[in-house]
């Protein structure tokens, strides 16, 4: 593209069509090149000549942002772009500006502008750039870092990608990327992106961010893959159904529609090019997974990017096939499947399936892997954000994770997106301006979307004759409590540390949490009725309560709590703006109440009480009771729900963030 | 910039031999999995051969099983596919690939078996 004046003036031009591609983290030359015919210009007799300037500058959303000045042999580099940006040939050919570019970002993109003045004369020649691809962590179906090199290619190119490499990567990490996983690139070395340095993502860099490496590997070692999606021809679309897919299904559908299940790597491309659906669907690799470009709480925990549903709390395994989802669909014809027999052994099946368990939730590492990176991606997930968006899609955390969460966390989680309310929204249908505390009867009130990754389900608490059993943790983490800390933690809900007897008899009425809890005898058990790997304990697969036996005091579980019957009622609160967690407390204090702790929460539950709207509780616990199981408001099981800040299960909420209250008096 | 160039293809009686190449650049040709597939006139693509990056690993299609051989010489960045015992049926355009996006691809080179 050439601007310039009429002849015998100053002429610069860029001989490249426009707009030009090029991949991420290649680099880029421009030729700019320009004709001066007044060189050279002097002002006056006595003064020097004045040299020309070149200007290079990138042109994106009206910003400009100049990368580059020249004058006079010298050259003068925006700091941000230092050792990225260079005029190769000036100043030794002093009439060229091409501009050569390192290590191109998607950022990169735009339109970059080559001027040059010489005295009063100015002229100058664009060119539009995109850089094209995206790069993607990948991880086999069954468990983290089970990919040898070769199968690490392999599961990039049966996802219409092929294996990474560094200056991609660093590329992608420029842009933002950000993943505390050990991956394989074309190099052969493993390396992984990390911007804000944490313990267990420390790497070979310390506290500095930066792209993490450990070299050259062995292709014999195991570690999971990044993956570099180049372009598509094709479109990515969704086909639903009101009851959904299994995924057979799901692949006939796209099949009776012209297409096939799309790949991993042609989502992250519709991802990358504006794709947004809060619904998960099946992919071609039997994954589900779902595309977020506009961050919002209730869709992928108000985090931008390609969210997967993973069964197990730690981010591994696949939902089963015969779950329902969306179809996700790919029509082109510019992929062509490589067949399973073309790597050997079809598909994942040659990769062996490791469980996980009770107590550690550790994975088989490599050598050079330290206990902590291993649990650094397991332990840190994402905190939502339930007021405000984020602009910029950097993943903070190393996973995306589930839409909507089933029972509770290690031993074993068993995730599943569906259908379902956002319990801690405000009605969209309410009276606006509510002073009183007001019931809404949930029919009333149904929004379909997807539940936030927040909010997970307490399966069933059984009703006893004379109370509830129920399992507490603190809202800070799993596994924290001794069993003084135990006995405390149920009297502050409103409740006592519960009996053996009383968790068999729950048990017997059909409870069933797959987490060790200290009981009112020091032993450490949990209930069991569909025994399931890590679920067994000491039972194998019978059904049955689980014990671990006398435990020493000082060791640190969750506890199993029981609440007899209430003296008083449970109400539930709200108003237009909601409230935080101390204006819940103020707001029942001017109703002649307290917060309910969460036993009272259980025992009115126990009488009754059902609520599709989660509340403040008064260990600042948001939760909300369910006596009819409906698919809208969070399963198929009665139960207290709990929302939690952190997929694992654990995690308060941001007390300044705004929900509904339940008030006891 | 990425680049696949085939050679090597050309007019052959059944039962001749044929080796075909592939020059790579732009690309870590030592550490990709390579391909090698075809397409016949009015046909759809067909995968021929696969060689992992190492080239400890090779797997053929059922048809070109034990008359085909798909190789590399890394320090040279060139694919081969060796074809012996060539039939009317193996007469197609031969692509070399590195990923399953035809866009990738280069620009082939044709083989017809005819008598």
């Known amino acids: 593209v050439e601007v310039s004046e009429p002849d015998n003036s100053l002429s610069v031009s860029i001989p490249e069509p426009s707009p030009l591609r090029v991949l991420l983290g290649s680099s880029l030359t421009i030729p700019c090149y320009f004709i001066d015919p007044m060189h050279p210009v002097t002002t006056a007799p006595s003064t020097a000549p004045l040299a020309p300037r070149i200007k290079w500058s990138r042109i994106s959303k009206e910003k400009e942002v100049v990368l580059l000045v020249a004058t006079e042999g010298r050259v003068r580099v925006n700091s941000a772009y230092q050792d990225k940006v260079t005029l190769p040939n000036y100043p030794a050919i002093p009439s060229d500006a091409t501009l050569e570019i390192q290590n191109m970002r998607s950022n990169d993109s735009g339109i970059l502008r080559c001027e040059v003045m010489h005295g009063i004369e100015d002229s100058q020649a664009t060119l539009e750039v995109v850089v094209k691809g995206i790069v993607f962590h990948y991880r086999a179906i069954s468990t983290r870092y089970t990919l040898d090199f070769d199968r690490a290619q392999r599961a990039c190119l049966q996802n219409s990608a092929i294996i990474a490499t560094p200056e991609q990567l660093q590329a992608a990490y420029e842009d933002g990327f950000h993943q505390c996983d050990a991956g394989w690139l074309a190099d052969q070395t493993v390396r992984y992106p990390i911007h804000t340095p944490r313990e267990g993502c420390y790497g070979d860099k310390d506290e500095f961010p930066g792209v993490r490496t450990y070299g050259i590997r062995d292709t014999n070692e195991t570690y999971d893959v990044y993956c570099f999606a180049e372009e598509m021809e094709g479109e990515v679309f969704y086909a639903t159904s009101p009851e959904k897919f299994t995924f057979q299904e799901a692949a006939n559908e796209c099949r009776r529609l012209g297409a096939r299940l799309a790949t991993t790597g042609q989502l992250y491309l519709a991802w990358q090019g504006g794709m947004d659906m809060c619904s998960a669907g099946w992919l071609a690799d039997r994954s589900v997974r779902y595309p977020i470009s506009k961050a919002r709480p209730n869709c992928g925990g108000n985090l931008l990017g390609v969210r997967t549903v993973y069964l197990h709390a730690n981010q591994t395994g696949y939902p089963d096939p015969s779950s329902r989802y969306d179809a996700i669909c790919y029509t082109g014809e510019d992929f062509v499947d490589i067949p399973e027999s073309f790597f050997g052994v079809g598909g994942e099946e040659d990769i062996t399936i490791q469980t996980v368990t009770w107590p550690d939730v550790e994975l088989p590492l490599p050598r050079n892997i330290t206990e902590g990176e291993a649990r650094g991606s397991v332990i840190l997930t994402a905190k939502p954000d339930f007021e405000v968006s984020p602009t910029a899609p950097e993943p903070e955390e190393p996973f995306t994770f589930v839409p909507e969460v089933r029972a509770t966390a290690f031993p074993e989680v068993e995730n599943r997106t569906e259908e379902a309310t956002r319990p801690w929204a405000f009605p969209r249908e309410s009276t606006p301006g509510l002073g009183a505390p007001t019931a809404f009867t949930s029919e009333d009130l149904v929004v379909q979307v997807t539940l936030a990754p927040g909010a997970a389900e307490v399966p069933g608490q059984p009703r006893l004759p004379g109370g509830v059993v129920f399992h507490y943790r603190p809202g800070s983490s799993r596994y924290s409590l001794t069993f003084e800390e135990a006995k405390q933690a149920c009297l502050r809900t409103g409740a006592i540390i519960a009996s053996p007897e009383q968790l068999q008899a729950a048990y017997e009425a059909g409870y069933e949490q797959c987490d060790a809890g200290w009981l009112q005898d020091q032993t450490v058990r949990y209930p069991i009725v569909s025994p399931r790997t890590p679920c067994v304990g000491d039972k194998d697969s019978s059904p049955g309560v689980r014990t671990y036996g006398v435990r020493p005091p000082s060791e640190t579980y969750d506890v199993y709590c029981y609440v007899d019957r209430l003296e008083g009622e449970v109400f539930f609160a709200t108003r237009l703006e909601q409230f935080t967690f101390w204006e819940a407390q103020e707001f029942c204090e001017s109703q002649n109440a307290t917060l309910a702790t969460t036993g009272q929460l259980y025992a009115a539950w126990s009488r009754g009480l059902d609520k599709c709207y989660a509340g403040w509780l008064a260990d600042g616990s948001l939760r909300y009771p369910i006596v009819t199981p409906r698919p809208a408001c969070g399963g198929d099981k009665p139960g207290v729900r709990t929302v939690y800040l952190y997929p694992n299960q654990t995690g308060l909420l941001d007390p300044l963030s705004r929900h509904h209250a339940f008030c006891f008096r | 910039e990425v680049q696949l160039v085939e050679s090597g293809g050309g007019l052959v009686q059944p039962g001749g031999s044929l080796r075909l190449s592939c020059s790579a650049s732009?690309?870590?040709?030592?550490?990709?999995?390579m391909f090698w597939v075809r397409q016949a006139p009015g046909k759809d693509y067909e995968w021929v051969a696969s060689?992992?990056?190492?080239?400890?690993?090779?797997y053929y299609d059922d048809s070109v099983k034990g008359r085909f051989t798909i190789s590399r010489d890394s320090a040279k960045n060139t694919l081969y596919l060796e074809m012996n015992n060539l039939k009317p049926e193996d007469t197609a355009l031969y692509f070399c690939?590195?990923?399953?996006?035809?866009?990738?691809w280069g620009q082939g080179t044709q083989v017809t078996v005819s008598s």
């Open positions: 732009g690309f870590t040709f030592s550490g990709s999995w």
């Open positions: 060689i992992n990056s190492s080239g400890g690993r090779t």
């Open positions: 690939a590195r990923s399953p996006r035809v866009g990738s």
